[in-house]
């Protein structure tokens, strides 16, 4: 009865050149998940379909890996990967649930600089 909620990894940061796992979890509903779409702004990154399995968009094939679970792994991160990511759960009979993750990709030197000069 559309009682579900999506828990996400929230706002996350990662280093340029590294990788990150985007994770969402749908809870508090008995609805059946038929498909999860992963999108960045209006671009479809990947689909995990209950019947057909995973499909990665051709333009992201080299840098996106399915999983773990219904999550998505982004590899070889660039500063251009900074932005909002959405997990869109298509369920029956509830319909659509959407979760949001904000990813900030930091220059390696900035990340190192930040670590080196932390205020105690």
């Amino acid at each position: 009865m559309m009682t579900g909620t999506i828990e996400t990894t929230g706002n996350i940061s990662a280093e340029k050149g590294g990788s990150i796992i985007l994770q969402c979890h749908l809870s508090s509903t008995t609805a059946q998940v038929t498909q999860v779409n992963w999108e960045q702004q209006d671009q479809l990154l990947a689909i995990c379909n209950a019947d057909l399995g995973w499909h990665i968009s051709p333009s992201f094939k080299d840098r996106v890996a399915p999983g773990p679970g219904l999550g998505l792994t982004l590899q070889s991160l660039t500063v251009n990967d900074t932005g909002e990511y959405f997990c869109i759960y298509h369920t029956y009979p509830d319909g659509t649930y959407t979760g949001r993750i904000f990813l900030e990709v930091l220059e390696s030197s900035v990340a190192e600089h930040g670590a080196r000069f932390q205020i105690p």
Partner: antibody, heavy 123, light 107 residues
Amino acid sequence: QLQLQESGPGLVKPSETLSLTCTVSGGSISSSLYYWGWIRQPPGKGLEWIGSIYYSGSTFYNPSFKSRVTISVDTSKNQFSLKLSSVTAADTAVYYCAREAGRGTTGLLFDYWGQGTLVTVSS
Amino acid sequence: DIQMTQSPSTLSASVGDRVTITCRASQSISSWLAWYQQKPGKAPKLLIYKASSLESGVPSRFSGSGSGTEFTLTISSLQPDDFATYYCQQYGILPRTFGGGTKVEIK
């Protein structure tokens, strides 16, 4: 404009299998946003949901029909189908196909319907 | 299954009348209720969803209210085009179930 059109025999003999197809035009059955359902209406009576399907083949059935019903999808033809086995006179009804779509976070609703096809079960 | 009970089953009214149809659910369905209009020989048409949200293109004389187990559909000023049968449907819990219908006829 999305259109749905039911087709199939108008007369089925008792104990046989009722088979209907719904052809979708003006939109893709493969959209991840929609589910596709069958509803029936016996003459002079109310509406009864039979079941629904997702483009990839996931099915959802009314337990009242579960042992007798099969819904399938053919994305290459933009069609989905209903099979109801071991029919009796009580299965005589107008059969509708319909699209189930969301309205934001408001669940799934039957927003587009076919015009319906009358199936009579009689020997 | 959730039983949906509509009343009255038939309603006689005149053009310009304010008409109210009631739908009761056998258990709480929150606001997951839709109203459909059906004319003879035609498919049902979605009017209202989530108990009170008007479907795009539906005249504003139609309104819905209620939550939990009791819901109403109101036509503020009945028009000639509104003589039809109206069905409520719960879509919160499987299986989806419909009310028995209310026929609005000319007095």
